[in-house]
Amino acid sequence: IPTEIPTSALVKETLALLSTHRTLLIANETLRIPVPVHKNHQLCTEEIFQGIGTLESQTVQGGTVERLFKNLSLIKKYIDGQKKKCGEERRRVNQFLDYLQEFLGVMNTEWIIES
Amino acid sequence: IPTEIPTSALVKETLALLSTHRTLLIANETLRIPVPVHKNHQLCTEEIFQGIGTLESQTVQGGTVERLFKNLSLIKKYIDGQKKKCGEERRRVNQFLDYLQEFLGVMNTEWIIES
């Protein structure tokens, strides 16, 4: 990811910029953007970044608001890179089963599951 | 999700079945399946279930191993439903920003981020 700062620092800075520019961003009161119904955020990265694209096109650019959208673009690049890493390594069945067990374990303990 | 038991119970049962049938499942020592490199599992659901499909096609069916793959199929249906819910509600910008802030907050605190 082509950025001088680590992704974790980038996320922190983006949170601060989002807070700073909130008033400017909500100026368009008629615009509609998809908001996921649940809190399993990682399942919705595509829609989240589509929403960011819509918001960017409707926001007057300049100053640090540009920095906010640049950061969000870098975060998208990082996530796209992570998605590529889902299928790059083909390994033995026992290693796949370890990962599947871990996935189901996380789903069991951390996901917000509605019946 | 068309199942008589809640998804949370389904996940628990699947974990138990996975443990029970592990020896049978790893019998094919030549089979190679994509295993994600990182622990942000939700980003990799597509690859995980493709891997399950590959494994199922290579496994002799019958008894409770069939139940395992049926459960995994129901879990996939649940996740597909959750993915649909990412874009069904198109709301005002302020509600989108709340979700974006929450997403970045979770990314900041819970994701396993490599620089």
Partner: antibody
């Protein structure tokens, strides 16, 4: 199957309020939003407002000051209340489920405002 | 508010004919983020609520016959019925699903010749 059933009065006195209940089946109000739309010969179809799956609301600015939408998800009921009705509020009032757009509609409640 | 203008206001047709009705919006209904046109079409028969036919300008709702086709982008949209059946006689409404408030056209009434 998905159904929305409406109940409410047919006749309302001028300056009084209108209350309609929309009872849904075949889906959960924690997963889907519900819109309210009215239809009159003079003004055609008019969108009034929506209550989202999470409980937040959005209203048409024209009706905001006298409209309230709430719900009891455990009873699968959505409540619509409009204050200070005048003769030009005579219309058929509909509730409709949100899934991207308004995919299922109630049968409608015909409301006449007259003394 | 986005104004939706439908034309014609009524159409007289014979069974089996191809029918085209138009809907024009006062602002573009194309969203840059998802590159989708947020427009829906509904059919309403007398004494019934509207029924969803098309959303996203061209996506047919499940169970809707394939003789109904939605097309268009930006501000100009079309609903085509390739071979009109007797049960298609109704009023057809387009709806802006792009921005709040959601707004509807005045309708196109499909009548039998």
């Amino acid at each position: 199957q998905v159904q929305l059933r409406q109940s409410g009065p047919g006749l309302v006195q001028p300056s009084q309020s209108l209350s309609i209940t929309c009872t849904v089946s075949g889906f959960s109000l924690t997963s889907y939003g519900v819109h309210w739309v009215r239809q009159s010969p003079g003004k055609g179809l008019e969108w009034l407002g929506v209550i989202w799956s999470g409980g937040s609301t959005d209203y048409n600015a024209v009706f905001m000051s006298r409209l309230s939408i709430s719900k009891d998800s455990s009873k699968s009921q959505v409540f619509f209340k409009m204050n200070s009705l005048q003769t030009d509020d005579t219309a058929i009032y509909y509730c409709a489920r949100n899934r991207y757009v308004l995919d299922y509609w109630g049968q409608g409640t015909s409301v006449t405002v007259s003394s | 508010d986005i104004v939706m203008t439908q034309s014609p206001s009524s159409l007289s047709v014979s069974a089996g004919e191809r029918v085209t009705m138009r809907c024009k919006s006062s602002q573009s209904l194309l969203t840059s983020g998802d590159q989708k046109n947020h427009l829906a079409w509904y059919q309403q028969k007398p004494g019934q609520p509207p029924k969803l036919l098309i959303y996203g300008a061209s996506t047919r709702e499940s169970g809707v016959p394939d003789r109904f086709t939605g097309s268009g982008s930006g501000t100009d949209f079309t609903l085509t019925i390739t071979s009109v059946q007797a049960e298609d006689l109704a009023v057809y409404y387009c709806q802006n699903d792009h921005s709040f408030p959601l707004t509807f056209g005045a309708g196109t009434k499909l009548e039998l010749k």
